[in-house]
């Protein structure tokens, strides 16, 4: 059997000879050189050589435990003559013994960390870690202790964990933001002769809201013309806050002053300024100066710093309204006037009024915008604003006239304003009713008396207030001895009825009936329309079969003896 124990070898051997490791030996070895010892495995033949006769093993190179702490090799004892193993191949271990040849190395050359300003003493900042490549299981070569070389009295380090904590109360970022801390890690438990390494920790104090906003001045003054429309910015105010980021965000608000309803303040998120804007229309003639109380406050407040005072500040803003030469102002936004369509030229319809709102009360002249009255139907008195007709009107042609009147300051023609005028033309009964269409009808030769052969409808261009009321009758000259009668239906229609039994188309092929249509308005208007009636041959159902077409083609010379 094999005779050896585990081999141990000290790392970093510096002797001039090969380093002796140990001896492989089989109890089958008679010492006569008949056995050959063979080494294989980790580093065999290179790092480790064996005397094949004696089994003595030597290390040929300086070994570093940190590179490889254990070598696993295999041993054979073979009969030189036959090649027969005298022992089974066996595995053995060479363990490299540690010396303290490695200093602790931090995982980072430079650490970066942050901690909130004003943190309590003992607040965790960051943990640094140093590793020592030496053997942690043997001696203190890898036992690391941390200490602070630079960064006191602001920070401290826990010797065993490498945890860095704050060590000073009320560290104020606004005073100092950056700290460079140097930490040492020393092995041998920090004892004399230990190896050490250092790292730098760059610590930045992060901001907390421990500063209120402050206006740099107590009063601001701005001017704005009275013509500024709502939303117009008239000035910017800015409070400063020593904090940063959201802790320095400021919200502005108007808390008091007689301009409370007239002005707004909005916060410019980019510049953190308060922009004073016009909220309602200003009027120099009504009020020339406004004062506002504007407040700047932090929207995000940390309760633990409220003892430092309120996180807001206020300033007075004085706004001077400047006078602007304003155009005349009409008494109404629009005027609606009425006039009868039979009005004579120069009839006054009504009037408009405009005044200069300025203190000067400049006189005003009036005119019609001719682009809105191309036919010059209306005119205006330039002095008093009276509107009158300059042409005859016809409601049936145009019911509404929409024109624009201009008021201009006499002393400053650039100042003008406009107002719409809506003129309604009122109806007068100046049109007679007439047939709604051309009527041409027929009667069967075998027609019976009082038979309806046609219904008549009328139209009238007028638009009477109480609606149309038409009456129908035969013209006086045709009334006596007529072959047909007109029956007024009293509903603005009338019927033509036969007056006898049977008609002979050979005797009379066509009848012309003059019908008088009258309206019921004042003054009464009437017209006469003619209805053509042809006599036709019909079937027993009363359906027309044939008529004298010539009656249509040659209407002249027809009898009017209807």
């Amino acid at each position: 059997s094999w005779m050896w124990n585990q081999f141990f070898l000290l790392e970093e051997y510096t002797g001039s000879d090969y380093q002796y490791v140990g001896k492989l030996h089989s109890d089958q070895d008679r010492g006569d050189g008949s056995l050959k010892y063979i080494l294989s495995g980790d580093g065999a033949g290179d790092l480790f050589i064996i005397n094949e006769n004696t089994g003595d093993i030597q290390a040929t190179k300086r070994l570093d435990r940190e590179e490889k702490p254990v070598y696993i090799l295999r041993a054979q004892a073979i009969n030189r003559r036959t090649g027969r193993p005298v022992e089974p191949e066996s595995e053995f271990i060479i363990k490299i013994h540690d010396i303290n040849d490695n200093e602790p190395i931090f995982t980072k050359e430079v650490y970066t960390a942050t901690v909130p300003e004003m943190s309590d003493v003992g607040t965790f900042v960051v943990q640094v870690t140093a590793t020592d490549a030496d053997d942690p299981t043997y001696g203190n070569s890898a036992k690391v202790v941390y200490s602070i070389l630079q960064g006191q009295p602001y920070f401290s380090v826990e010797s065993e964990t490498g945890i860095i904590k704050t060590a000073l109360l009320n560290m104020d970022r606004e005073n100092r933001e950056q700290y460079q801390v140097v930490i040492q890690a020393k092995d041998m438990g920090g004892q004399m002769g230990g190896l050490s390494g250092t790292t730098t920790v760059n610590i930045t104090l992060t901001d907390v809201n421990d500063n209120p906003p402050r206006f740099p001045q107590s009063t601001y003054q701005f001017k704005t013309p009275e013509s500024s429309p709502p939303g117009t910015p008239i000035g910017r105010i800015k409070a400063s806050d020593a904090d940063v980021g959201e802790n320095a965000e400021i919200e502005y608000s108007i808390t008091d002053g007689e301009g409370l309803d007239m002005f707004d303040v909005i916060t410019d998120q980019e510049t953190q300024e308060g922009i004073i804007t016009v909220k309602k229309l200003l009027d120099f003639e009504k009020k020339k100066v406004y004062t506002l109380k504007v407040e700047a406050s932090n929207p995000y407040v940390e309760p633990r710093f409220l003892y430092l005072g309120p996180f807001k500040d206020s300033a007075t803003v004085r706004i001077v309204v400047e006078d602007v030469d304003e155009p005349p102002v009409f008494s109404k936004l629009a005027y609606i006037l009425q006039i009868r369509e039979d009005a004579q030229i120069n009839t006054t319809i009504g009037s408009v009024t405009a005044q200069d709102p300025d203190a000067a009360r400049n006189p005003v002249k009036y005119s019609v915008d001719r682009h809105t009255d191309m036919d010059r139907i209306f005119n205006i008195d330039s002095g008093n604003g009276s509107i009158f007709t300059s042409k005859l009107l016809d409601r049936e042609t145009l019911l509404w006239h929409n024109i624009t009147v201009i008021a201009t300051e006499i002393n400053n023609p650039k100042q003008s304003s406009r107002v719409p005028l809506y003129i309604k033309v009122l109806d007068v009964n100046d049109n007679a009713p007439e047939f709604a269409e051309f009527y041409e009808t027929f009667v069967c030769e075998k027609a019976k008396a009082d038979q309806l052969i046609q219904t008549l409808h009328a139209v009238d261009k007028d638009d009477p207030y109480s609606g149309h009321q038409f009456s129908f009758s035969l013209a006086p000259e045709a009334a006596s001895g007529s072959n047909f009668t007109i029956q007024d239906n009293k509903d603005n229609t009338a019927g033509i009825l036969t007056r006898k039994n049977g008609y002979n188309r050979h005797e009379m092929s066509t009848y012309l009936l003059p019908v008088v249509i009258s309206d019921n308005d004042y003054p009464v208007q009437s017209s006469t329309g003619t209805v053509t009636v042809r006599v036709c041959a019909c079937d027993h159902h009363g359906n027309m079969q044939s008529c004298h077409a010539e009656a249509l083609i040659h209407p002249t010379g027809l009898s009017t003896g209807a």
Epitope: K36, N79, R80, R81, T82, G83, R84, P85, P88, E89
Partner: antibody, heavy 117, light 111 residues
Framework: EVQLVQSGAEVKKPGSSVKVSCKAS????????MHWVRQRPGQGLEWMGD????????HYTQKFKDRVTITVDKSTSTAYMELSSLRSEDTAVYYC??????????WGQGTTVTVSS | DIQMTQSPSSLSASVGDRVTITCRAS??????????MHWYQQKPGKPPKLLIY???NLESGVPSRFSGSGSETDFTFTISSLQPEDIATYYC?????????FGGGTKVEIK
């Protein structure tokens, strides 16, 4: 370079002896066993015996035990094989071969021994 | 004595063919995982040349087309792709026990 150089061909009478030499070079002579192998015409290989040059320990096959003697001269790094009582069936090529862990890694060029009356 | 039976005694194959020779020992020639079987090549008029030792180890300088395998009593020698220069007689040999013995040889020829 390892070399094994054998003595020249021999013609012998039946009943006589022959001594074949094998001079080694290119390695430490005493570190390796030296073997002798013969090959009769048209036949296979036949191991005869071997010697440890450092201690002159020998091993012979039973067939040749009484007739063969293997010796060495360490000073000249030469091995010898003497075969006595020769018979016609001893006509063969005789090889020396270096032994290493049971295998023959280097061989001499061979010596032809002819036994004829 | 340990008898070594080698087969076939001769074979003829084409260039590029895979050639396999077997050697059977009359008893085991293996111990502690070591197989004391070796293979040689002998060309006419020349001494034998070691190709494979301890059953499967290729001797330095020998082409990789030669290989060996096996354990205990059964061993195989293979030429993966026969070349013209491989025409020779091949022998197995055991060193497990005295006397050391050789197989009868296998003569390899090209078709």
């Amino acid at each position: 370079e390892v070399q094994l150089v054998q003595s020249g061909a021999e013609v012998k009478k039946p009943g006589s002896s022959v001594k074949v030499s094998c001079k080694a070079s290119g390695y430490t002579f005493t570190n390796y066993w030296m073997h002798w192998v013969r090959q009769r015409p048209g036949q296979g290989l036949e191991w005869m015996g071997d010697i440890d040059p450092s201690h002159s320990e020998t091993h012979y096959t039973q067939k040749f035990k009484d007739r063969v003697t293997i010796t060495v001269d360490k000073s000249t790094s030469t091995a010898y094989m003497e075969l006595s009582s020769l018979r016609s069936e001893d006509t063969a090529v005789y090889y020396c071969a270096r032994g290493d862990l049971g295998r023959f890694d280097y061989w001499g060029q061979g010596t032809t021994v002819t036994v004829s009356s | 004595d340990i008898q070594m039976t080698q087969s076939p005694s001769s074979l003829s194959a084409s260039v590029g063919d895979r050639v396999t020779i077997t050697c059977r020992a009359s008893e085991s020639v293996s111990i502690h995982g070591t197989h004391l079987m070796h293979w040689y090549q002998q060309k006419p008029g020349k001494p034998p040349k070691l190709l494979i030792y301890a059953a499967s180890n290729l001797e330095s300088g020998v082409p990789s087309r030669f290989s060996g395998s096996g354990s205990e009593t059964d061993f195989t020698f293979t030429i993966s792709s026969l070349q013209p220069e491989d025409i020779a007689t091949y022998y197995c040999q055991q060193s497990f026990e005295d006397p050391w013995t050789f197989g009868g040889g296998t003569k390899v020829e090209i078709k």
